[in-house]
């Protein structure tokens, strides 16, 4: 029997009946065995076919078989109902070998020319399977010349049988307090030859509850308990299962915080698997009862391990643990069923006793000593001598625990001294130096420190004076002895004040004229204002209208009198303002240098002399009455004059205060 070529030779060729293309003889039998390489098959087709036709091809025939299977028995020239001729058909071996048998019987009614066929090896596409047949590979099939290989989707690994995809379904750890887990691909059929391990691992104190949901379908056996595929549940206390079949297992209350679920499958079957919804529970904590005037959030039916609640107080109430304030409060339920901290109180906000108001008082409006939320107090300043600055003095205890004004201020109001009050009323005429009476010049300050000088009280902690009067003490402010509230220079009854700092105008040059002869003394404490101690006002912008030529100002002090001694009693003199040009001219004659009188000075006195300030009065105020406000203000500071006080044709020269308002305001606001 002729054999066809064998692999590894090239597998292709031609076959023909004996004597082809001539007629074939009777009683012939010829057999060809063709063999292709592994992974290949043989393809065969006829280019000529002419055999005797007989019922079921019993006489002459060509038979094609592959292994034990007959692929075709062929005869005739064209197919009939019961016989088959190849026509244009192509025949394929089932494996890598193909047997071709030609036979002719003892006679032919007429001559037949037989057949001619061509064959070739071709790659088998193992990935192509007939409908109804099991697929070659579980997931992906890849054909190549001479063979194929299988691969798997992500999450699977190829089994050692090289065709099955086993699920990579181990090592998943669930740590949430509830969740779902299921067999791979659920609700589609689960993979074969897989071993899955799932862990639920919760914090100590939790207990896992397992509920099987939706459907349960795991391959089973009628007699043996889960021999093929099975599901097992293991805790540190006990094992549940194995489970298989189609019935949903009952709820499992594990009483454990750790659970291991094992699912094992074999190589066969087509089942949808399972789905578990797990929850957890723990020993509940006592139900939190909100404190009065507070509420709990969130509200839950019960609170278990790790659950928490916060307390929020109503407006006007605050969280307190005893006397200690808390901005927020959150308690967490512990594994032993207790809260990690005790419940605070929501106490009504208490703003506490209001601060004392210097030079003022406070009145409880809501009720005596009531300082809690929404309570009202009223600050007021001591009448006559103080006035309230900025607000109306009404404060409310707000939810933040601070007394707050109607303008939203949390700071105290300020009682500012009333300035420019005097017991004295001025007349229009000029008369000689007079003794001052109590309350006439309550701003008058006596400055002792090397020499005797004067000053005027501003606000309740500043003194306005002349630079030349305190120049020597500018670096030793504490050396200044400052007295006020007295008329008698040598009286032991006075209010003592001490200097904290001396501010001399930066434009003042000592012993080189008296331009910018102005200074401020900051007192180290505020003085109490009364009828004998009251500040002088600073001039308003409009003050120039009360300081024109011939307007009357009043100078006061303990300076030299006509007798040549310092006055024992405070003296004052009413003097008119002198025309500036006239004054300038008066001091242009020797011994005075040109330019002695500057625009920062004003002059006052009589042309005839006799009324003047003198040594010892330096730094004191030349004051004027503002007829609109009915308050006295400082227009000048006693600065310099002729060597002989009260000399005819000479005048007292005063620092013009209105030129220095910005300087004064800056110093006071900065310090």
């Amino acid at each position: 029997t002729p054999l066809g070529p064998k692999w590894p030779e090239p597998v292709f060729g031609r076959l023909a009946s004996p004597g082809f293309p001539g007629e074939y003889a009777n009683d012939q039998e010829r057999r060809w065995t063709l063999t292709a390489p592994p992974g290949y098959r043989l393809r065969l087709y006829f280019t000529h076919f002419d055999l005797e036709l007989s019922h079921l091809c019993e006489y002459d025939f060509v038979k094609l078989s592959s292994g034990a299977k007959v692929l075709a028995t062929l005869c005739g020239q064209e197919s009939t109902d019961t016989e088959r001729a190849p026509g244009k058909d192509t025949f394929y071996s089932l494996g890598s070998s193909l047997d071709i048998t030609f036979r002719s019987d003892y006679s032919n009614e007429k001559p037949f020319t037989g057949f001619e066929a061509f064959y070739a090896a071709e790659d088998i596409d193992e990935c192509q399977v007939a409908p109804g047949e099991a697929p070659t590979c579980d997931h992906h099939c890849h054909n190549h010349l001479g063979g194929f290989y299988c691969s798997c989707r992500a999450g699977y690994v190829l089994h050692r049988n090289k065709r099955t995809c086993s699920a990579l379904c181990s090592g998943q750890v669930f740590t949430q307090r509830s969740g779902e887990l299921s067999s791979p691909e659920y609700p589609r059929p689960y993979p074969k030859l897989s071993s899955c391990t799932y862990s639920i691992s919760l914090e100590e104190g939790f207990s896992v509850i397992l509920d099987f949901v939706e459907s349960f379908d795991v391959e089973t056996h009628p007699e043996t308990l889960c021999p093929y595929d099975f599901l097992k549940i293991q805790t540190d206390r006990e094992e549940h299962g194995p489970f298989c079949g189609k019935t949903l297992p009952h709820r499992i209350e594990t009483k454990s915080n750790t659970v291991t679920i094992t699912f094992v499958t074999d190589e066969s079957g087509d089942h949808t698997g399972w789905k578990i919804h797990y929850t957890s529970t723990a020993q509940p904590c006592p139900y939190p009862m909100a404190p009065p005037n507070g509420h709990v959030s969130p509200v839950q039916a019960k609170y278990i391990l790790k659950d928490s609640f916060s307390i929020f107080c109503e407006t006007g109430y605050e969280l307190l643990q005893g006397h200690l304030p808390l901005k927020s409060f959150t308690a967490v339920c512990q594994k032993d069923g207790s809260w990690d901290r005790p419940m605070p109180a929501c106490s009504i906000v208490d703003c506490g006793p209001p601060d004392d108001l210097p030079s003022g008082r406070v009145e409880y409006i809501t009720g005596p000593g009531v300082t809690t939320y929404k309570a009202v107090i009223q600050y007021s300043c001591e009448e006559t001598f103080y006035t309230m600055k900025v607000n109306d003095g009404k404060y409310v205890c707000e939810a933040d625990g601070f007394w707050t004004s109607s303008k939203g201020e949390k700071s105290l109001p300020v009682c500012e001294p009333v300035c420019g009050l005097s017991a004295r009323t001025t007349g229009g005429r000029i008369y000689g130096g007079q003794k001052a009476k109590p309350g006439d010049f309550p701003w008058q300050v006596l400055i002792l420190g090397g020499t005797t000088a004067a000053g005027a009280l501003l606000y309740d902690n500043w003194v306005l004076t002349a630079a030349h009067a305190v120049y020597e003490q500018k670096h030793d402010a504490s050396a200044l002895d400052i007295r006020m509230g007295t008329l008698k220079r040598l009286s032991p009854h006075y209010t003592q004040a001490w200097s904290e700092a001396v501010f001399i105008h930066e434009g003042y040059t000592h012993d080189a004229g008296f331009d910018n002869d102005i200074a401020l003394i900051k007192l180290n404490n505020k003085v109490v204002i009364n009828s004998n101690i009251t500040p002088i006002c600073l001039p308003r912008k409009e003050a120039e209208s009360f300081m024109r030529t011939d307007d009357i100002g009043t100078a006061s002090g303990w300076g030299l009198t006509q007798r040549g001694f310092l006055a024992r009693n405070l003296m004052y003199v009413d003097i008119p303002i002198v025309d500036h040009q006239k004054c300038t001219a008066a001091y242009e004659k020797p011994p005075y240098p040109r330019g002695s009188v500057t625009a920062n000075m004003l002059c006052a006195g009589l042309e005839s002399g006799g009324k003047d300030s003198c040594r010892g009065d330096s730094g004191g105020a030349l004051v004027f009455l503002d007829s609109e406000t009915e308050r006295w203000f400082v227009g000048g500071i006693v600065s310099w004059g002729s060597m002989n006080c009260g000399e005819a044709g000479q005048y007292g020269v005063y620092t013009k205060v209105i030129n220095y308002i910005p300087w004064i305001e800056n110093i006071i606001s900065d310090f």
Epitope: Q321, G322, H323, L324, P325, L326, K327, S328, F329, D340, R341, P342, P344, G352, D400, G401, F402
Partner: antibody, heavy 116, light 107 residues
């Protein structure tokens, strides 16, 4: 990590004023709780002086109310103790501490001697 | 002012013993009491707050109990590092006050 650190002069003369600073790191003094000054006298007796709360409100020991003031600088996360008219009786180690529910931290303390 | 009385200035103990430090308030302070441990040259360290709640990091051999006026700090299985002074502290009302301290020492 919450840390408190006191700083101050160490020695003060009688009748003078005392100022101490507590610098806080690791937590904002405006976030929560009460920020306290506590002192420990020789012999280990502890005395609470007062606190300034997260909101800036103060509470003082009535025995010191006329002399004490507690303030803060939120930009520097510091709070301060001011004590006027000190006497030798104020000689102690001064601690700043935050006291609150489940939140308790103390500084190392700064010794103060009042002596002429 | 609420006076916190620690009647025992000193207590002698041995390693492994159980010891109870007591504190009595002059008036009701609810459970607003803390316990502190202080070692020489160190600042006080909080052990217990609100009478019975242990601060994290504090060994569970320290337990606090009581409410109202009577409070106890119990140390079971005393260790050598527990030898220190213990203060009770009420934070119920102004002024906050401390006990005078109880010194734990070895027998």
């Amino acid at each position: 990590d919450v840390q408190l650190q006191e700083s101050g002069p160490g020695l003060v003369k009688p009748s003078q004023s005392l100022s101490l600073t507590c610098t806080v790191t690791g937590y904002s003094i405006t976030s929560d709780y009460a920020w306290n000054w506590i002192r420990q006298f020789p012999g280990n007796k502890l005395e609470w002086m007062g606190y300034i709360s997260y909101s800036g409100r103060t509470s003082y020991n009535p025995s010191l109310k006329s002399r004490i003031s507690i303030t803060r600088d939120t930009s520097k996360n510091q709070f301060f103790l001011h004590l006027n008219s000190v006497t030798t009786e104020d000689t102690a180690t001064y601690f700043c501490a935050v006291l609150g529910l489940y939140f308790d931290y103390w500084g190392q303390g700064t010794p103060l001697t009042v002596s002429s | 002012d609420i006076v916190m009385t620690q009647s025992q200035k000193f207590m002698s103990t041995s390693v492994g013993d159980r010891v109870s430090v007591t504190c009595k308030a002059s008036q009701n302070v609810d459970t607003n009491v803390a316990w502190y441990q202080q070692k020489p040259g160190q600042s006080p360290k909080a052990l217990i707050y609100s009478a019975s709640y242990r601060y994290s990091g504090v060994p569970d051999r320290f337990t606090g109990s009581g409410s109202g006026t009577d409070f106890t700090l119990t140390i079971s299985n005393v260790q050598s590092e527990d030898l220190a002074e213990y203060f009770c502290h009420q934070f119920n009302s102004n002024p906050l006050t401390f006990g005078a301290g109880t010194k734990l020492e070895l027998k």
